[in-house]
């Protein structure tokens, strides 16, 4: 069958029909429905929402909708023994205690089952000691403390401000520095935008607001007790001592009212420079310990949370493809929230719901996509991407053979300024072409394309007249598909004009104040940005599932490979003497990139010219495109990170949210001047260049003519 015969409608009309069916009012209605009560992973509330979504997706017209459950390690506060932090005097009396809960927002005073702020997976403990302020607790912050300021964190409780990097990296850094506890807080410098009121009068964080979140260092493992395999009924579970990624010291988050009380008494060293000062009226002294009058006072943490194996539920919907049912395009986003989930995740889940409804409407009119579309409502994303990872582990053999693309659908908005896209280079042209066809929702860009407003507001740093598209990092459900399985992936959302705080999130992130009203009153009253994101995500899925030739351009991978090779070479060239001494050469990598570029160019020429009416040749060419991303996977994974297997991209070892290019080489070079055995260290650099060069060459060869 030809594609048109299978789908009954001309391709152009299909896409227009799909996009025209998406309605802002429906997204608004779905968001309201999804945000009236909390949907914490492992609770009946979230299970009921899973069943509701299952039922509605069936009504919308999907061929099948199933629940997939797993029994994974989650973490919860003790209901009768709350977590808090004290200042204690020399007699051990608690003279100040942090708050036990966030003051509920207006209209939500009577809602039960709001989980109090906690750091998920913190071990239990009641450490007490002197405080050290460690800025953002980044790698460079600890370098500054330990190497420049000669401040020892061993045996201290550290207090770090949220922002810049994933909180799990902060905790890992504190552990490595010898800290015995970590206090995380939101500083107004990072979570209070000037000129905006705090919630409920604006979108800023009030002093009693607190960011929840997990503090794991899973490195892609999924359930900490069953790394590599699904947490099913017959799973063999590791003991808690062997679990992957659990922190070893107590951790607890607080708001800036409570942080003020801790930080105002700090003594010891002054902050090293202005980048260590936030916006509180405190000196931002580093410590250790409190100043003169208060020097006998200590800080004590009281953490009683427990880790429990708990059942979670994914919803998996299928719309069977008419021509290539064994090729899967996946649209997935999570359902579980810390509290109401007004932005994270329900602004994304509402968009997925409307996309499913639109596809279902077309299906009821007799249309089917060329390829199968899978829709997923993931559980337990907030606890370490657990639902998506367990499902992918269970279905890895199918996915690695049949997975065409994965489009992520968490929060649709983190601002209302412009589009933000992170994706594989294979999707650059798809995103460019699609956004040129969509209307911009931005004020001042009426009648203009989304591409135009996006390019104007967020220009590419390398190519004029093009928008910025970022590397995929992690911290969301695409991780297992892209970093472990090598399935081409992408994500899109509306963002803020706040490049400096790229990884801090929006002010009310993971707090009780992330409500429907936050979105409806302050971020997107007309739901026009949500609609645009639905069009981008849905449009990408539509094209990926329905294009006769997959909308991947391998030449764009060639361009970025050259850019990444240049970048890593220049990092290495900061050590010219050692490169000479240890005979470090990047020739093999540059040669492989050159070969990739030439082969990709020839492949693209053949792609223009081949007989698309020959289903065997069409399938062969599409398979070469589909499997290109897979070709960048190293089955052995990255050093000490076996589930990060993509050689070109991995989450940064210093910030899970950020993507790093040629991560194997990058990590081998990182802080190499401090390594005790330079010969061994530079040997590892050479090995990583070899792995990268081989992988790029091998990937190039998958695009060569098959015989």
């Amino acid at each position: 069958k030809s594609s048109n015969e299978a789908t009954n409608i001309t391709p152009k009309h299909n896409m227009k029909a799909f996009l025209d069916e998406l309605k802002a009012e429906n997204i608004k209605k779905f968001l309201y429905n999804f945000t009236q009560i909390p949907h914490l992973a492992g609770t009946e509330q979230n299970f009921q929402l899973a069943k509701q979504i299952q039922s509605q997706w069936k009504e919308f017209g999907l061929d099948s909708v199933e629940l997939a459950h797993y029994d994974v390690l989650l973490s919860y506060p003790n209901k009768t023994h709350p977590n808090y932090i004290s200042i204690i005097n020399e007699d051990g009396n608690e003279i100040f205690n942090t708050s036990l809960f966030e003051p509920p927002p207006p209209g939500y005073e009577n809602v039960s089952d709001i989980v109090p702020p906690f750091s998920a997976f913190s071990p239990q403990g009641m450490p007490e000691g002197d405080l050290v302020y460690v800025n953002y607790a980044r790698t460079e912050d600890f370098f500054k403390l330990e190497r420049d300021m000669k401040i020892n964190c061993s045996g201290k409780i550290v207090i770090a401000r949220y922002g810049k990097v994933f909180r799990g990296n902060k905790v890992k850094n504190a552990q490595l520095a010898g800290a015995k506890g970590v206090i995380l807080y939101s500083d107004p410098a990072d979570y209070f935008a000037p000129g905006v009121k705090s919630y409920p009068d604006g979108w800023n964080l009030p002093g009693g607001g607190v960011q929840r979140g997990n503090i794991l260092n899973l490195n892609g493992a999924g359930d900490p007790l069953t790394p590599g395999y699904p947490a099913n009924e017959y799973a063999y579970r590791r003991g808690i001592a062997e679990a992957v990624g659990l922190p070893s010291i107590p951790v607890h988050p607080i708001g800036y009212y409570d942080a003020q009380k801790l930080l105002e008494k700090m003594g010891g060293s002054a902050p090293p420079d202005s980048s260590w000062r936030g916006s509180l009226k405190v000196p931002y002294n580093v410590g250790p310990g409190f100043t003169g009058n208060f020097s006998t006072q200590k800080v004590k943490m009281h953490i009683h949370s427990t880790n429990e194996v708990t059942r979670i539920y994914n919803v998996i919907g299928t719309l069977r493809g008419a021509v290539e049912p064994d090729r899967y395009v996946i649209l997935g986003g999570h359902r579980d929230s810390w509290v109401f989930g007004g932005i994270d995740p329900q602004s994304g889940a509402a968009v997925v719901h409307e996309i499913v409804r639109s596809f279902g409407t077309l299906k009821k009119e007799g249309w089917r996509p060329r390829r199968t579309i899978l829709f997923a409502s993931w559980d337990a994303e907030e606890f370490g991407l657990l639902g998506s990872t367990e499902w992918a582990e269970e279905n890895s053999r199918l996915l690695q053979e049949r997975g065409v693309a994965y489009i992520n659908a968490d929060s649709s908005i983190e601002g209302n300024y412009t589009l933000r896209v992170d994706c594989t280079p294979l999707m650059y042209s798809l995103v460019h072409n699609l956004t040129k066809e969509l209307k911009s929702p931005d004020e001042g860009f009426e009648g203009k394309s989304l591409y135009e407003s996006w390019t104007k507001k967020s220009p590419s740093p390398e190519f004029s007249g093009m928008p910025r598209i970022s590397k995929l990092g992690s911290g969301n459900d695409f991780e297992v598909f892209f970093q472990r399985l090598g399935i081409a992936s992408g994500r899109a959302r509306y963002t803020k004009n706040w490049e400096t705080n790229k990884f801090s999130g929006y002010p009310l992130y993971h707090s009780v104040y992330e409500t429907y009203e936050l979105v409806e009153k302050f971020y997107d009253p007309m739901f026009k940005y949500h609609l645009t994101v639905a069009q981008v995500r849905g449009g990408m899925v539509f094209e990926l599932a329905n294009s006769i030739v997959l909308p991947f351009d391998c030449r764009d991978y060639a361009v970025v490979l050259r850019k990444y090779a240049d970048k890593i070479y220049s990092i290495s060239m900061k050590h010219p003497q050692e490169m000479k001494t240890y005979s470090v050469s990047f020739d093999s990598l540059f040669s492989a990139v050159k070969n990739f570029t030439e082969i990709a160019s020839k492949f693209s020429e053949r792609l223009q010219d081949f007989d698309k009416s020959n289903p065997i040749v069409l399938r062969m060419m599409n398979d070469q495109l589909m499997f290109l991303e897979r070709a960048f996977i190293d089955p052995l994974g990255l050093p000490d990170r076996p589930f990060y297997r993509h050689v070109i991209y991995a989450p940064s070892s210093h910030n899970k949210y950020a993507g790093e290019s040629f991560p194997g080489i990058y990590d081998a070079l990182f802080d190499i001047e401090s390594k005790v055995d330079p010969s061994k260290a530079w040997g590892e650099v050479k090995r990583q260049i070899y792995v990268a060069a081989f992988t790029v060459q091998a990937a190039a060869e998958t695009l060569s003519e098959v015989a």
Epitope: I37, T43, F47, D71, T80, N110, S112
Partner: antibody, heavy 121, light 107 residues
């Protein structure tokens, strides 16, 4: 259709033990727990305890701790409540009820039909 | 233990009447309260969970609400099949406790 079917009525002598069963069907047994509640003649309802078969955890009302044992057989989707050292004031209708296995739940949604236990010398 | 004080213990009403039953909690239970119906034969059915959410299949004449520590079950228009005993149940903290019951009889 969710169903909880309890075993038949029992007559026991003081000091004896009774074991009441509750067979579940129409849902995934290990996704839920079973609570046990009793009602003495003409009286109100009293919660005795609950068991979560997936993880084997049991929680008891202090009033019954040491006298009651809750168990579950996952292979047959059946929960059991054994009450020992029976007294005349244990004469009651004993109910099982389904409860979601999770950190927060909405307590008992479906109930068994009840089992009458009479303790009489 | 949390005490649940239910009132009235019994009431007589006619078909079509509006009926309200109240439970007062001795401690804060948030919205962790259910309403149960027990028919004369002994069968128990949950009507409302989490203070105000209606179970599937339960007629919309039943509703639940809260004011402070007082929780109310309302039957907007009593039907013949509604004559039964009604209990509140708090599940905020263990041991879970029930109100004493309200028997709704035909006037």
């Amino acid at each position: 259709e969710v169903q909880l079917v309890q075993s038949g009525a029992e007559v026991k002598k003081p000091g004896a033990s009774v074991k009441v069963s509750c067979k579940a069907s129409g849902y995934t047994f290990t996704s839920y727990g079973i609570s046990w509640v009793r009602q003495a003649p003409g009286q109100g309802l009293e919660w005795m305890g609950e068991i979560f078969p997936r993880r084997g955890n049991t929680y008891y009302n202090e009033k019954f701790r040491g006298r009651v044992t809750l168990t579950a057989d996952k292979s047959t989707s059946t929960a059991y409540m054994e009450l020992r050292s029976l007294r005349s004031d244990d004469t009651a209708v004993y109910y099982c009820a389904r409860v979601f296995d999770g950190y927060y739940n909405y307590a008992m949604d479906y109930w068994g039909q009840g089992t009458t236990v009479t303790v009489s010398s | 233990d949390i005490q649940m004080t239910q009132s009235p213990s019994s009431l007589s009403a006619s078909v079509g009447d509006r009926v309200t039953i109240t439970c007062r909690a001795s401690q804060d239970i948030g919205s962790s309260l259910n309403w149960l119906q027990q028919k004369p034969g002994g069968a128990i059915k949950r009507l409302i969970y989490a203070t105000s959410s209606l179970d599937s299949g339960v007629p919309s004449r039943f509703s639940g609400s809260r004011s402070g520590s007082d929780y109310t079950l309302t039957i907007s228009s009593l039907q013949p099949e509604d004559f039964a005993t009604y209990y509140c149940l708090q599940y905020a903290s263990s041991p879970y406790t029930f109100g004493g019951g309200t028997k709704v009889e035909i006037k």
